[in-house]
């Protein structure tokens, strides 16, 4: 089948990194600088993406693959293929329309991006607060108060924290 197809269409023999040059009797020509073809049999090479402005190059363009961009320091990617850059904030903050703002009491953000999320409500699982929450960290839930009563022979390990964003206050 491959042989038949190549007899019908000489371009099918052109590998990735080349294009089928109609101006040169359908010879496989290398992609020009700043262009690529990621599959064989292409009649043109695609132009490489430029990582300029707030974007910077994460992976250089090659003859067989496009460039990949990320964001300059102090920013992080949003959208498919890093199609927008958003300012980082500090842990314990969230980005608002007025810039980076500290998390309100009872919420936290342990990353440089995203929103402040409510602390886990330990009592929903019958647990007690072992370590208080901060702007940067969720609370750590410990054993239930009953487990800590005199005569209790063992202490249950801390339960994994629920997804804080899903916990009602």
């Amino acid at each position: 089948f491959e042989r038949t197809r190549s007899l019908q269409d000489p371009c099918s023999n052109c590998p990735a990194g080349t294009f089928c040059d109609n101006n040169r009797n359908q010879i496989c020509s290398p992609c020009p600088p700043n262009s690529f073809s990621s599959a064989g049999g292409q009649r043109t090479c695609d132009i490489c993406r430029q990582c300029k402005g707030v974007f910077r190059t994460r992976k250089e363009c090659s003859s067989t693959s496009n460039a990949e961009c990320d964001c300059t320091p102090g920013f992080h990617c949003l959208g498919a293929g890093c199609s927008m850059c958003e300012q980082d904030c500090k842990q314990g903050q969230e980005l608002t329309k007025k810039g980076c703002k500290d998390c309100c009491f009872g919420t936290f953000n342990d990353q440089k991006r995203g929103i402040c999320r409510p602390w886990t409500n330990c009592s929903l699982d019958g647990k007690s607060v072992l370590v208080n929450g901060t702007k940067e960290r969720d609370v750590v839930c410990g054993p239930s108060p009953a487990d800590l009563s005199p005569g209790a022979s063992s202490v249950t390990p801390p339960a994994p924290a629920r997804e804080p964003g899903h916990s009602p206050q």
């Epitope: 695609d46 132009i47 993406r49 430029q50 300029k52 402005g53 707030v54 974007f55 496009n66 300059t72 320091p73 102090g74 920013f75 949003l78 959208g79 498919a80 293929g81 890093c82 199609s83 927008m84 850059c85 958003e86 300012q87 329309k97 007025k98 810039g99 980076c100």
Partner: antibody, heavy 115, light 107 residues
Framework: QVQLQQWGAGLLKPSETLSLTCAVY????????WSWIRQPPGKGLEWIGE???????DSNPSLKGRVTFSVDTSKNQFSLKLNSVTAADTAVYYC?????????WGQGTLVTVSS | EIVMTQSPATLSVSPGERATLSCRAS??????LAWYQQKPGQAPRLLIY???TRATGIPARFSGSGSGTEFTLTISSLQSEDFAVYYC?????????FGGGTKVEIK
């Protein structure tokens, strides 16, 4: 709320230099790239160029080196100069923040070039 | 430079109807495309980036699709405030370029 406020001379004679300034209020100034875009009356949008808070610039080759950008980080302001203007430079000029797309825009300044 | 072509130049639609706007790039730009809305006497407003991601505060009736060279902006049910001019813009390659715009007018 990030706001961009721009100003500059609205009426110029041919061969004069267009000069516009854009001030950024709210949000951060450093790290971002700040752009100028123009729109001739009743027409589409044309990107003029951009400047980063550090001073690095890029501009549209169609303007053939007539354009100069500057930045004043102490005032959170950036400026555009376009020399040797002609009637073809008559347009509404916008400043905008560049985060990939242009996510915040100034109100626009109509610049008319007429003898 | 990458040339962006929008069609149609004018689209006449009744309120409540669906509007479909097209944008074509002269070369593949992956999904590195934005859509803007511009009303008379106002600056453009970012609607969509990355071809399909709605910008902050943009209603769900606006949606973007496409990749490579063919892109679409769909307004599912036109409201009175949606009658405006819409521009696509590529930021895949410099110089940054815009389409010529599609005016969405009341039928």
């Amino acid at each position: 709320q990030v706001q961009l406020q721009q100003w500059g001379a609205g009426l110029l004679k041919p061969s004069e230099t267009l000069s516009l300034t854009c001030a950024v209020y709210g949000g951060s100034f450093s790290g971002y790239y700040w752009s100028w875009i123009r729109q001739p009356p009743g027409k589409g949008l044309e990107w003029i160029g951009e400047i980063q808070h550090s001073g690095s610039t890029d501009s549209n080759p169609s303007l053939k080196g007539r354009v100069t950008f500057s930045v004043d980080t102490s005032k959170n302001q950036f400026s555009l100069k376009l020399n040797s203007v002609t009637a073809a430079d008559t347009a509404v000029y916008y400043c905008a923040r560049l985060t990939g797309p242009f996510d915040y825009w100034g109100q626009g300044t109509l610049v008319t070039v007429s003898s | 430079e990458i040339v962006m072509t929008q069609s149609p130049a004018t689209l006449s639609v009744s309120p409540g109807e669906r509007a479909t706007l097209s944008c074509r790039a002269s070369q593949s730009i992956s999904s590195i495309l934005a859509w803007y809305q511009q009303k008379p006497g106002q600056a453009p407003r970012l609607l969509i980036y990355g071809a399909s991601t709605r910008a902050t505060g943009i209603p769900a009736r606006f949606s973007g699709s496409g990749s490579g060279t063919e892109f679409t902006l769909t307004i599912s049910s036109l409201q009175s405030e949606d009658f405006a001019v819409y521009y696509c813009q590529q930021y895949y390659n410099w110089p940054l370029t815009f389409g010529g715009g599609t005016k969405v007018e009341i039928k």
